[in-house]
Interface confidence: low
Amino acid sequence: GSERTCCPVNWVEHERSCYWFSRSGKAWADADNYCRLEDAHLVVVTSWEEQKFVQHHIGPVNTWMGLHDQNGPWKWVDGTDYETGFKNWRPEQPDDWYGHGLGGGEDCAHFTDDGRWNDDVCQRPYRWVCETELDKASQEPPLL
């Protein structure tokens, strides 16, 4: 495919990535699928600077990111290494809390009202952020 050199309409460019900020809520899996259908992924936060950028745009609202531990260890959806990467958990989090009464623990990460991360039940209908990198090959065929 061709390389994407500018962001799609209604996406925000920042540091060679494009971001789309939802204004409605979906379960984590549905949000993940939405981003994939846009040839993107749920946002992967790799630095303080990116954390602040996203936080500025989402405000004090619970918002899904591309981090989960549904298969055991914490993983970023784009393969970024979790152990050596940036982390912004609230103190005492993640705690895989079982006391919510919804069955199971908490396997999906979201931004909380102050920007810090929390793990929560993946079925909760939170807003979400999609991200795609500029200069990566687009899935769309090139124009002839």
Epitope: W48, Q51, K52, T84, K87, N88, G115
Partner: nanobody
């Protein structure tokens, strides 16, 4: 060698104010998040507040939100904690700490602490 030297603690009456300082050396201060933690008598370490490397991202524990303000002066390699409306439960040894580069929760160096006593 990383060094963090806290100062500014002391005895203050309930409702009073103090400003803690932390002078840092031995590392590039402007590249790291910094935090304040405290340890009350007979208790464990409690996170109080922290601040992004450029000073624009600040976070507070619920117990101090609206009363404490964290700030930093990168030109002086100094971290501050302005503490207002102090309460007896704020009595503790306050430590400044250098955050690890890949985390805003973990720290790898901390100072010797400064004692804050809130009592009438």
């Amino acid at each position: 060698e990383v060094q963090l030297l806290e100062s500014g603690g002391g005895l203050v009456q309930p409702g009073g104010s103090l400003r803690l300082s932390c002078a840092a050396s031995g590392f590039t201060f402007s590249r790291y998040g910094m935090m304040w933690v405290r340890q009350a008598p007979g208790k464990g370490l409690e996170w109080v507040s922290d601040i992004a490397p450029d000073g624009r991202g600040t976070y507070y524990a619920d117990s101090v939100k609206g009363r404490f303000t964290i700030s930093r002066d990168n030109s002086k390699s100094t971290l501050y904690l302005q503490m207002n409306s102090l309460r007896a439960e704020d009595t503790a040894v306050y430590y400044c700490a250098k955050m690890m580069p890949t985390s805003t929760v973990s720290f790898d160096y901390w100072g010797q602490g400064t004692l804050v006593t809130v009592s009438s």
